[in-house]
Interface confidence: low
Amino acid sequence: ENSEQKENVEKEGLCNACTWRQNTKSSRIEAIKIQILSKLRLETAPNISKDAIRQLLPKAPPLRELIDQYDVQRDDSSDGSLEDDDYHATTETIITMPTESDFLMQVDGKPKCCFFKFSSKIQYNKVVKAQLWIYLRPVETPTTVFVQILRLIKPMKDGTRYTGIRSLKLDMNPGTGIWQSIDVKTVLQNWLKQPESNLGIEIKALDENGHDLAVTFPGPGEDGLNPFLEVKVTDTPKRSRR
Amino acid sequence: ENSEQKENVEKEGLCNACTWRQNTKSSRIEAIKIQILSKLRLETAPNISKDAIRQLLPKAPPLRELIDQYDVQRDDSSDGSLEDDDYHATTETIITMPTESDFLMQVDGKPKCCFFKFSSKIQYNKVVKAQLWIYLRPVETPTTVFVQILRLIKPMKDGTRYTGIRSLKLDMNPGTGIWQSIDVKTVLQNWLKQPESNLGIEIKALDENGHDLAVTFPGPGEDGLNPFLEVKVTDTPKRSRR
Amino acid sequence: DFGLDCDEHSTESRCCRYPLTVDFEAFGWDWIIAPKRYKANYCSGECEFVFLQKYPHTHLVHQANPRGSAGPCCTPTKMSPINMLYFNGKEQIIYGKIPAMVVDRCGCS
Amino acid sequence: DFGLDCDEHSTESRCCRYPLTVDFEAFGWDWIIAPKRYKANYCSGECEFVFLQKYPHTHLVHQANPRGSAGPCCTPTKMSPINMLYFNGKEQIIYGKIPAMVVDRCGCS
């Protein structure tokens, strides 16, 4: 009888261990909540609604700095965890697709390509590389293609709406279409420094007969051939204080 | 009987180990999913269909490079140590929003901006940096803006109610509004030393036509554009007794 | 000085660090701007008797302890702070460091 | 500091690294472009007792805890990140590194 009792106690012990862990999860969280309030010297949790937060939270540099580059980091006094990384993912490459722009629509009434919207999180001085990728449709005969990337500007007195960014000449042979990359690091950095100057770009890739080979608004079967910007940024995680 | 019981318990132990491993596989994966979203700063998995991916995903070299030569890279690990901590949180940055002040209301009957209330816990000698941030509305034509920050004082015999803190002149171009920061470290330290002297400030940012560009009481669509104070403090934790 | 890691479903009875995520959004603490959640973790489990303990603190054994005798405790051996950005209820946003909020390692003491 | 490697069918009771593949396609996470799956692994098994402790926090044993004592745990001693290519839900594709996603080695600590 005794050995049976002992066995039951042991079995019950294993069950109790589970129950105990389950049971204490909520009380642990409650304890942590109390601890946080205490550590922040707050008697109660501030009563502030989401709407109030949206209204009060300054959309401004120091806040953006703290929130956007928010990092749950380790303090120097504690070496942190098993690996030399911060908790959050570090962004290395951003692929940005074109979006619609009112200004581009106004130019001659029909949508034009391309307007790229940027997050204020990208700092111009963190840009390592920025390339505009465009897809050129296949040609039927060997031809020379003149690629021109124009930047839209506010209309000048003489009516000028564009200024050149980059031009290049390339030879194409029949077969499949090709992807062509164009360095736009400088223009992107300027856009990031002066967002209001980013009104969009126009892409032209004319063959010898004046046909535009650039895919700007993909037609049937042209999914995934939109122009896009590939931006490589440096976001070296500092072994920072958490 | 006892040995049979013991054998059953051992068998059950082996079964439990298997069950446990099977059982936890899904919950481990759930935990990893939650962890990935958290590490990518995503609240939920982006809701994007296979079709949308096919349309959006550029069929292009940089993407192909990343996918085809895809590499799950390893980092060397480093480990951690203990931390010398006090019980309470150490504050590094304080963002203070303006509140209403009876004195400011009395000045000419309508509310004026701005009164900043400070906690007596901020010690004047711990202030490393104090900046007043103000948002200046966009201008339509290039203009010079005269920014003036005045400190309210108890009315003097000659009726003076203000004394200058800081003035600056800046050039603004059409486009978006701008955030301007003004160093107010000295005045803040004085307020902390003599709280009764903190009666509020007045902010003016006049363009060449005398229009005030400073957002002091945000209008529609101006959420988050209130002036605010950014105070950086040094709060070296003492190893206190708990 | 190493510490074990378990999960909630572990059959391990000895001192272990268990995952515990504190999700501020889940209990409506919108006043915490960042982080929205963090991994706090906790220690739990059994310890063998230790005769020479590093710290002389009394080990509290709860009334339901079936053995009734005191022994060493499963406790954090390494902790770290978190940085937090929050509204303090006085029209202020604070960015500060809260010490000892994450259990990095558990051990017996 | 080396660790044991086991598989799901292993009878090894000591601390061991077990394989665990996370297959993003299997649970419909199409927004992750690459990798489509990766080996996360996990640690499980028994450890010998560790006696010395570093931290003075007293562990209060809950009334339902049947034992009230503790020991060391089988935990990752080396972890590594994975690189990931993914849609972030804002018309952008991100290529980045996610830390501590792969268990490379398990040990007792």
């Epitope: 389950q22 999860k25 909520s26 609604s49 | - | 909630e8 889940a26 409506g28 | -």
Partner: antibody, heavy 119, light 110 residues
């Protein structure tokens, strides 16, 4: 005092649309999930749907396509709309604070309102 | 669809006896512990007893306790009192906004 109170028609004809309102006091709907649960006479509880504090909605599989839950935070009201009512939908409809399976959700309920579907 | 099965359908015990109510889910509840127990008396709304499978809700007598994980859960009333006569429901959460109730166990006091 924290309360929830359901209100709406007591009688609905088949094929008609039911609209019930849950009025709360002492609860900030921008911080709190609200659930709807129903109970047919002499039967068990049946989960209907939830509106989260953020405004996301989740519906029971049987209710999808027929059910809409919305809220007006400023009025402290949550509204349940169920189309194409059928006699089998005759039940007492309850609104509850939180999610009755997560954390301490379901710690507070309204008294319920009996809705009869009959021609 | 998720099915939550409660057993027995009816339990008839004397005051002071131990009541054990079972709840089995056709699939694991989220995080293995998204399970609550409710008590309902005729003409009243349900009352929360237990959440997170085993945590006693505020103001609930300690004779009520919950246990279990994953798919199998138990509500125990250690010493039945006359006022415990009621129908008891389990409710499970499954992630992705999916929730379900059991069909209930009626507890009668002899």
């Amino acid at each position: 005092q924290v309360t929830l109170k359901e209100s709406g028609p007591v009688l609905v004809k088949p094929t008609e649309t039911l609209t019930l309102t849950c009025t709360v006091s002492g609860i900030d709907l921008s911080h709190t999930d609200i659930s709807w649960v129903r109970q047919a006479p002499g039967k068990g509880l049946e989960w209907v749907g939830i509106i989260s504090y953020a405004g996301s909605t989740y519906y029971a599989s049987w209710a999808k396509g027929r059910l809409t839950i919305s809220k007006d935070t400023s009025k402290n009201q949550v509204v349940l709309t169920m189309t194409n009512m059928d006699p089998v939908d005759t039940a007492t409809y309850y609104c509850a604070r939180g999610v009755p399976a997560y954390s301490h959700g379901g710690d507070l309920w309204g008294q319920g309102t009996l809705v009869t579907v009959s021609s | 669809d998720i099915v939550m099965t409660q057993s027995p359908a009816t339990l008839s015990l004397s005051p002071g006896e131990r009541a054990t109510l079972s709840c089995t889910s056709s699939q694991s509840v989220y995080h293995n512990n998204w399970l609550s127990w409710f008590q309902q008396k005729p003409g009243q709304p349900p009352k929360l007893l237990i959440y997170w499978a085993s945590t006693l809700a505020y103001g609930v007598p300690s004779r009520f306790s919950g246990s279990g994980s994953g798919t199998d859960f138990t509500l125990t009333i250690s010493s039945l009192q006359p006022e415990d006569a009621a129908t008891y429901y389990c409710a499970g959460g499954y992630g992705g906004g999916r929730y379900a109730f059991g069909q209930g166990t009626k507890v009668e006091i002899k």
